[in-house]
């Protein structure tokens, strides 16, 4: 039976050109965690092993960059970067645990400063 | 190419062991976690065992469990299931598949090797 | 452990058909179900996985739909070689269980 329960960052943004970190924890199981796959859609973005460690996709790799723990970084953020992202626990006996994150990337402050603010 | 090759079936009798051996080419074996999966003679598939890419986590149905052992050596790419105290139920096909890099599907399958369990 | 039913278990068909095989679990999977191609003399093959996900080098006349409990899988234009056993699998919770399957035979 499934009783873990995943918590994750929830909703976030960041500025276009920053980093942000996506972290996910799988509580309330004493599941073994096999792997954790990190996707953005369909995409498979990272890949965390029991075994082997991080494996980051190769079109991926320029701005991915693992950890802390099993989450992930994202680097050189993008408008394009917007959207959800999802941390997937692989356990036994368990099986499949999701945690979904959305991220927006806003444009920088200075940039939204500029827009919203006159200076007297 | 990729390839798995099961080898080790035969006729046994009750309570009798046999080791299951697949021989894998054609990808980084010490890569993929691996799985043996049965088919009945009803033409029903069962999920057997597993084991992760490094051997370190293995993981059994119930019907199998304390009975069958699943084992890999990565420098002879080489899946293993040993079967002990065998019964009527065990006899099928048995075949040992590549599961996906992403942990979802089991992407190649072998031919399969026959064990018939009979007295 | 999660309960698979496969419907139809046997389709006769024409080619050129588009035909649609049902899997229903016991309880909820997400979207974890894959399908897979049964051919007598040949190894199984992996078609659609996380319920509509295509695999790499399968022809996208093979589409998986569905979520939760109902799962579909949609074969379009049948060809002579598309005449086989189809299974499908949960590959949400240990253990994983497949379908009873479904042989798909030309009219």
């Known amino acids: 039976m499934m009783t873990g329960t995943i918590e994750t960052t929830g909703n976030i943004s960041a500025e276009k050109g920053g980093s942000i970190i996506l972290q996910c924890h799988l509580s309330s199981t004493t599941a073994q965690v096999t792997q954790v796959n990190w996707e953005q859609q369909d995409q498979l973005l990272a890949i965390c092993n029991a075994d082997l460690g991080w494996h980051i996709s190769p079109s991926f790799k320029d701005r991915v960059a693992p950890g802390p723990g099993l989450g992930l970084t994202l680097q050189s953020l993008t408008v394009n970067d917007t959207g959800e992202y999802f941390c997937i626990y692989h356990t036994y006996p368990d099986g499949t645990y999701t945690g979904r994150i959305f991220l927006e990337v806003l444009e920088s402050s200075v940039a939204e400063h500029g827009a919203r603010f006159q200076i007297p | 190419e990729v390839q798995v090759v099961e080898s080790g079936g035969g006729l046994v009798k009750p309570g009798g062991t046999l080791k299951l051996s697949c021989a894998a080419s054609g990808f980084t074996f010490s890569t993929y976690a691996m799985s043996w999966v049965r088919q009945s003679p009803e033409q029903r598939l069962e999920w057997v065992a597993e084991?992760?890419?490094?051997?370190?986590?293995?993981f059994y149905s119930d019907t199998v469990t304390g009975r069958f052992t699943i084992s890999r050596d990565n420098a002879q790419n080489t899946l293993y299931l040993e079967m002990n105290s065998l019964r009527s139920e065990d006899t099928a096909m048995y075949y040992c598949a590549r599961k996906t890099l992403d942990y979802y599907a089991l992407d190649y399958w072998g031919q399969g090797t026959s064990v018939t369990v009979s007295s | 452990d999660v309960q698979i039913t496969q419907s139809p278990s046997y389709l006769a068909a024409s080619p050129g058909e588009t035909i649609t095989i049902n899997c229903r679990a016991s309880?909820?999977?997400?979207?974890?179900l894959a399908w897979y191609q049964e051919k007598p003399g040949k190894t199984n093959k992996l078609l659609i996985y996380s319920g509509s996900r295509l695999q790499s080098g399968i022809p996208s006349k093979f589409s998986g739909s569905g979520y939760g409990t109902d799962f579909t899988l949609t074969i379009s234009s049948l060809e002579p070689e598309d005449f086989a056993m189809y299974y499908c699998?949960?590959?949400?919770?240990?253990?994983?269980?497949f379908g009873g399957g479904t042989k798909v035979e030309i009219k």
């Open positions: 084991i992760s890419s490094g051997g370190s986590h293995t």
């Open positions: 699998q949960q590959h949400n919770e240990y253990p994983w269980t």
């Open positions: 309880k909820s999977i997400s979207k974890y």
